[in-house]
Interface confidence: medium
C-alpha cells in the first residue's frame, strides 16, 4: 500500500535536492573537466567559469590538509603555491579562467576545486587529476558523467580548518540563520529518498552470505565497483 506513494515521492525529493544549490546561491562555478588522466610530465587544463560578480578565485587541492594552489584576481599578480611555481599558466579572466598545470608529477594526483569569492562561498564540482606512469595509463580511465557544482553560503558563525586561506561573503543574516534548519530538513528528506531508492533498487550491492554457523550470523558484503571509476567523484566538501 505504501509502495506507490514512495515511488511518487522519490522524483520529488531528487528534484528538490538538485535544485538546492541554485536556491541557496544565485551563482555556480562551472568547472571542467570533471576527471582527467595524464602521464607524468604532461599538462592539464582546468577551467573555472562563473556568471560574474566575482572578486577572485582560488584553485584548491582537497585532501586531509587542503591547500590553495593558486589565487587569481583580475589586475593582480597571481599567487601560486611554491610546489607549483613555474608550472602554472593562466588564460582568460577571473570570470572564465583556464589554469594550466605543467610537468605533472605522480604526487600531483588529486582533486582540485575552484573556489570563487562572491557574496557566498561558491565551489566548483572538482576535477580529479590522475597522473600515471606512461605504461600504466590504460588502467585508469575517466567516465563521462560530470558531478554537479555546489554553491553554499558560509554561515556567519565560526569554526576552523587546518589551512587558513579564506573566503565567504556577506550573507543575508536572515537567510544565513535559516540555512542550518533548511539544510537539516533537506538532508533528512534526501536521506529518506536515497533510502527509498536503495530499497527499490538493490542492484549495486550484492550480499554474498557464504556461510553461517550457530555462533555467527556473519554476512560478507561486496560492493560492485565495476563501473564506478571516476563516477565516484562528488561535489567537494567545503569543510575540507
Amino acid at each position: 500500500m505504501a509502495g506507490p506513494p514512495r515511488l511518487l515521492l522519490l522524483p520529488l525529493l531528487l528534484a528538490l535536492a538538485r535544485g538546492l544549490p541554485g536556491a541557496l546561491a544565485a551563482q555556480e562555478v562551472q568547472q571542467s573537466p570533471h576527471c582527467t588522466t595524464v602521464p607524468v610530465g604532461a599538462s592539464v587544463n582546468i577551467t573555472c567559469s562563473t556568471s560574474g560578480g566575482l572578486r577572485g578565485i582560488y584553485l584548491r587541492q582537497l585532501g586531509p590538509q587542503p591547500q590553495d594552489i593558486i589565487y587569481y584576481e583580475d589586475g593582480v599578480v597571481p599567487t601560486t603555491d611554491r610546489r607549483f611555481r613555474g608550472r602554472i599558466d593562466f588564460s582568460g579572466s577571473q570570470d572564465n579562467l583556464t589554469i594550466t598545470m605543467h610537468r605533472l608529477q605522480l604526487s600531483d594526483t588529486g582533486t582540485y576545486t575552484c573556489q570563487a569569492i562572491t557574496e557566498v562561498n561558491v565551489y566548483g564540482s572538482g576535477t580529479l587529476v590522475l597522473v600515471t606512469e606512461e605504461q600504466s595509463q590504460g588502467w585508469h580511465r575517466c567516465s563521462d558523467a560530470p558531478p554537479r557544482a555546489s554553491a553554499l553560503p558560509a554561515p556567519p558563525t565560526g569554526s576552523a580548518l587546518p589551512d587558513p586561506q579564506t573566503a565567504s561573503a556577506l550573507p543575508d543574516p536572515p537567510a544565513a540563520s535559516a540555512l542550518p534548519a533548511a539544510l537539516a530538513v533537506i538532508s533528512f528528506l534526501l536521506g529518506l529518498g536515497l533510502g527509498v531508492a536503495c530499497v527499490l533498487a538493490r542492484t549495486q550491492i550484492k550480499k554474498l552470505c557464504s556461510w553461517r554457523d550457530k555462533n555467527s550470523a556473519a554476512c560478507v558484503v561486496y560492493e560492485d565497483m565495476s563501473h564506478s571509476r571516476c563516477n565516484t567523484l562528488s561535489s567537494p566538501n567545503q569543510y575540507q
Epitope: V76, N121, S159, Q165, T166, A167, S168
Partner: nanobody
Framework: QVQLQESGGGLVQPGGSLRLSCAAS????????MGWYRQAPGKQRDLVAS???????TYADFVKGRFTISRDNAKNTVYLQMNSLKPEDTAVYYC???????????WGQGTQVTVSS
C-alpha cells in the same frame, strides 16, 4: 595555521572614530581573504567587511560609507577604520580568514568597541 590578534577597540562617543588592527602570524596571510566580524551581546556574529589578497573589498549594508577595510601584506595586518560610529556599532570585533570563518571552531579574543555618550 594563521593566528590572529585583534586590537584598537575602546570606548568612543557617537560620531567618533576608531581604527582596529588585526595582526596575523603565519605564511599564508598574503593569500588569505580576510574579514572583520562583529558580535553584539545576544546576537549572532555578522560579517562587517572583507578584503581579498588583491584589495577587493565588500561591506555589509549597515557599515557602508562609514567603515573601511584595508590590509598591509608586508606587515601581515588587516585594518578596519571605523568613522561616524553609532551606539548600535557596540560589539566585540573579530578578524578572521574570510573563506573559512563560517567553519572555524576558534576565534581570537576580539576587541571590544563601545559607542556611548
Amino acid at each position: 595555521q594563521v593566528q590572529l590578534q585583534e586590537s584598537g577597540g575602546g570606548l568612543v562617543q557617537p560620531g567618533g572614530s576608531l581604527r582596529l588592527s588585526c595582526a596575523a602570524s603565519g605564511s599564508k596571510f598574503s593569500i588569505a581573504t580576510m574579514g572583520w566580524y562583529r558580535q553584539a551581546p545576544g546576537k549572532q556574529r555578522d560579517l562587517v567587511a572583507s578584503i581579498t589578497p588583491g584589495g577587493n573589498t565588500t561591506y555589509a549594508d549597515f557599515v557602508k560609507g562609514r567603515f573601511t577595510i584595508s590590509r598591509d601584506n608586508a606587515k601581515n595586518t588587516v585594518y578596519l577604520q571605523m568613522n561616524s560610529l553609532k551606539p548600535e556599532d557596540t560589539a566585540v570585533y573579530y578578524c578572521n580568514d574570510f573563506r573559512l570563518a563560517g567553519l572555524r571552531d576558534y576565534w581570537g579574543q576580539g576587541t571590544q568597541v563601545t559607542v556611548s555618550s
